[in-house]
């Protein structure tokens, strides 16, 4: 796997353990938690970046309404369990035999249940919509330009392909950017955007987890953009399952 | 295989506007490539003017931004660059190229078309 | 910009020569690296991207190393073909993407 050859650190994950194991006397990262091998050259999956979390020592431009099915990530942290790829198995469970099921970026997607819920299959997340609020700045910002600048972010960033940003909503203070990722979409290699999203969200909470990288420092026309606020919706390709009770709470 | 050809007047005259074509073959124009020019002055080296994929915005080198449009024909299966208000430092041998990656390194290129600026 | 800067501009060597040319970014560019072989009338030619990733089809006497600021192409045993000039460029940064100055090999 590529990581940096001279000191042996995975730019992309902090979260890792490299040393010059690899074949040939390369370096091999792998991530806290899991111990799974990681590629330095791309986002590491969310599944295993919440799993080294978990490990590490505590410390018209209308906007977008989100779909009744729409998902937030209300449970937070928990230690996930991944598959051999990374990604998270179907059925979580914790350490009280309490199991539920999720969706492809880890979020809860019906009633907890015990160990004899069946979780059938991982519930692809295919379009996830992104709510900030910056703070007051002087003016708005131009929508275009602004528009611009979150592309070449998640372009250069996250090497999510544009295609996969299918709009940026702006209007004073909160923006929207819409991430859409289809299964028959995605090809191999490609940057999966329940990841991207994950990296933004960590990145614009100033925890970024790029090595040795600085912080997000997010600009447009030089006016800096500080986001005060963050909320994420998860949209399935099947829709969620939860109990009327849930709907109506 | 993959082609690109470059076609286009080889000789545009100072404040006036170069216009080039490529012709791509073997690959679909909207494939999940970038479509690029890059041109090398006489002598020199390399450098990239800018870049579009179908269904996206085209992006361009800061340098030229303000006279370069680059455009995509889907039904032609073709790509093209104008670049306006010319000099003599436009001169150049023109390539088109297919970009691959989420930013573009360039597996294929055309043979290039020597574009001279002159009255 | 990143700015490529690649060194040497020139250098001369023979047939069964080991040759190693560098390029330098100024700022991280993490691996996002490619290596390209042009020569005179003709187009450039792709050799090695994402660093150490060599092109299919080309011979693997051309390797690729570094990241970050620091990159090298190595060519482990030069043969008649190899005398041309050599180009870095990085794509980490689309805004815009960036060449090196070229090194020219010949024929000592």
């Known amino acids: 796997h590529t990581a940096a050859q001279d000191n042996c650190t995975c730019p992309t994950n902090k979260m890792t353990v490299c040393s010059p194991d690899g074949p040939g006397g390369r370096c091999q990262c792998r991530a806290l938690g899991s111990g799974m091998a990681v590629d330095c050259s791309t986002l590491t999956s969310k599944c295993l970046l919440l799993k080294a979390r978990m490990s590490a020592p505590k410390n018209a431009r209308t906007l977008v309404r989100p779909s009744e099915h729409a998902l937030v990530d209300n449970d937070g942290l928990y230690d996930p369990d991944c598959d051999p790829e990374g990604r998270f198995k179907a059925r979580q469970c914790n350490q009280t035999s309490v199991c539920w099921c999720v969706n492809s970026v880890g979020v809860r997607r019906t009633d907890k249940g015990d160990l004899s819920l069946r979780c059938d299959e991982l519930v692809r997340t295919h379009h996830i919509l992104i709510d900030l609020r910056h703070r007051p700045t002087a003016g708005a910002f131009n929508h275009s330009d602004l528009d611009a600048e979150l592309r070449r972010l998640f372009r250069e960033r996250y090497r999510l392909h544009p295609k996969f940003v299918a709009a940026v909503h702006y209007e004073q203070p909160t923006i929207q950017i819409e991430l859409r990722q289809n299964t028959s979409q995605k090809a191999a290699g490609d940057v999966d955007i329940g990841d991207a999203a994950y990296y933004f969200e960590r990145d614009i909470k100033g925890e970024s987890l790029f090595q040795g990288r600085g912080g997000l420092d997010l600009r447009v026309r030089g006016e800096p953009l500080q986001v005060e606020r963050t909320l994420i919706y998860y949209l399935d390709e099947i829709p969620p399952k939860f109990s009327m009770k849930r709907l109506t709470a | 295989q993959v082609q690109l050809q470059e076609s286009g007047p080889g000789l545009v005259k100072p404040s006036g506007t170069l216009s080039l074509t490529c012709a791509v073959s073997?690959?679909?124009?909207?494939?999940?490539?970038?479509w690029s020019w890059v041109r090398q002055p006489p002598g020199k080296g390399l450098e990239w003017i800018g870049e579009?994929?179908?269904?996206?915005?085209?992006n361009y080198n800061p340098s030229l931004k303000s006279r370069v449009t680059i455009s995509v024909d889907k039904s032609k299966n073709q790509f093209s660059l104008k670049l306006n208000s010319v000099t003599a430092a436009d001169t150049a041998v023109y390539y088109c190229?297919?970009?691959?990656?989420?930013?573009?390194?360039?597996?294929?290129w055309g043979q290039g078309t020597l574009v001279t600026v002159s009255s | 910009d990143i700015q490529m800067t690649q060194s040497p501009s020139t250098l001369s060597a023979s047939v069964g020569d080991r040759v190693t040319i560098t390029c330098r970014a100024s700022?991280?560019?993490?691996?996002?690296l490619a290596w390209y072989q042009q020569k005179p009338g003709k187009a450039p030619k792709l050799l090695i991207y994402k660093a150490s990733s060599l092109e299919s089809g080309v011979p693997s006497r051309f390797r690729g190393s570094g990241s970050g600021t620091e990159f090298t192409l190595t060519i482990s045993s030069l043969q008649p073909d190899d005398f041309a000039t050599y180009y870095c460029?990085?794509?980490?940064?689309?805004?815009?993407?960036?060449f090196g100055q070229g090194s020219r090999l010949e024929i000592k």
């Open positions: 460029q990085q794509y980490s940064s689309y805004s815009p993407i960036t």
């Open positions: 579009i994929y179908p269904g996206g915005n085209p």
């Open positions: 700022q991280s560019i993490g691996h996002w």
């Open positions: 190229a297919r970009g691959s990656g989420v930013i573009s390194y360039f597996d294929y």
């Open positions: 073997g690959d679909s124009i909207s494939s999940n490539n970038w």
